[in-house]
């Protein structure tokens, strides 16, 4: 069964800067990746970036840089201050869509005990939704 993993890391150099990494563990062809915060995309979450494998990348503040790391993983750097800045308990969600086969989504947040800049290697997160 395909799975999605999410890793959230706070940068040691800038405490208002977060890096979100997401990956898809499956054999399907990815048609779109959506990254949101505050909950799943379309269910109260706010879209930060969408990445299409052929047509490009769109991102919205406070997203600073979204990019493909591999054919099945992406990373997103967030930085902000004030109202648009993420906080330590913010939930980030990544959704990998393979149209029309299905979509898989998982969410994660900064580990409460982790030091800035340090985090465990990514582990598969539970699938929140699979169409």
């Amino acid at each position: 069964t395909p799975e999605v993993w999410v890793q959230v890391r706070m940068e040691a150099t800038e405490l208002s800067s977060f890096t979100i990494r997401c990956g898809f563990l499956g054999s399907g062809s990815i048609s779109l990746v959506t990254v949101s915060w505050g909950g799943p995309n379309g269910a109260g979450g706010t879209t930060l970036a969408v990445l299409h494998p052929e047509r490009g990348i769109r991102q919205w503040a406070p997203a600073r840089q979204a990019r493909w790391e591999t054919q099945s993983s992406i990373s997103l750097i967030l930085e902000g201050s004030g109202a648009s800045s993420p906080c330590a308990n913010t939930t980030f969600c990544c959704k990998f869509a393979s149209f029309p086969e299905g979509s898989w989504e998982a969410c994660g947040s900064l580990p409460p005990s982790s030091d800035p800049g340090l985090s465990a290697p990514p582990t598969p997160a539970p699938i929140l939704r699979a169409d």
Epitope: L32, G42, A43, H52, K95, D131
Partner: nanobody
Framework: EVQLVESGGGLVQPGGSLRLSCAAS????????MGWFRQAPGKGLEGVAH???????RYVESVKGRFTISRDNAKNSLYLQMNSLRAEDTAVYYC??????????????WGQGTMVTVSS
């Protein structure tokens, strides 16, 4: 959870008409774009038509002048009026919600699809 439910498909003779409907729920309807994709038997996916958040409709060349896309925000519904249907319009039609990349509406959510068969 986002839900898109299509209806209105069926069997129709060449030259006939059908109206597809899509009932949407579970998301903010004023999204980037909504539209219709189709997949003919043994063929790839094709974007048929979509409508932007500003209400501007866009069509693939092969359906221009025959198909009309519209949306009703009050009813959270999307429609595709298909006239002068041809055998090559036979396909599973998917209602999609997505994000714009230029003139392309990239599907982020979609329904189960409804089959349209054009045959005499």
């Amino acid at each position: 959870e986002v839900q898109l439910v299509e209806s209105g498909g069926g069997l129709v003779q060449p030259g006939g008409s059908l109206r597809l409907s899509c009932a949407a729920s579970g998301f903010t309807f004023s999204t980037d774009c909504m539209g219709w994709f189709r997949q003919a038997p043994g063929k790839g996916l094709e974007g048929v038509a979509h409508i932007d958040s500003d209400g501007i409709p866009r069509y693939v060349e092969s359906v221009k002048g025959r198909f009309t896309i519209s949306r009703d925000n009050a009813k959270n519904s999307l429609y595709l009026q298909m006239n002068s249907l041809r055998a090559e319009d036979t396909a599973v039609y998917y209602c999609v919600v997505g994000f714009k990349f230029g003139d392309y509406c990239a599907p982020n959510d979609w329904g189960q699809g409804t089959m349209v068969t054009v045959s005499s």
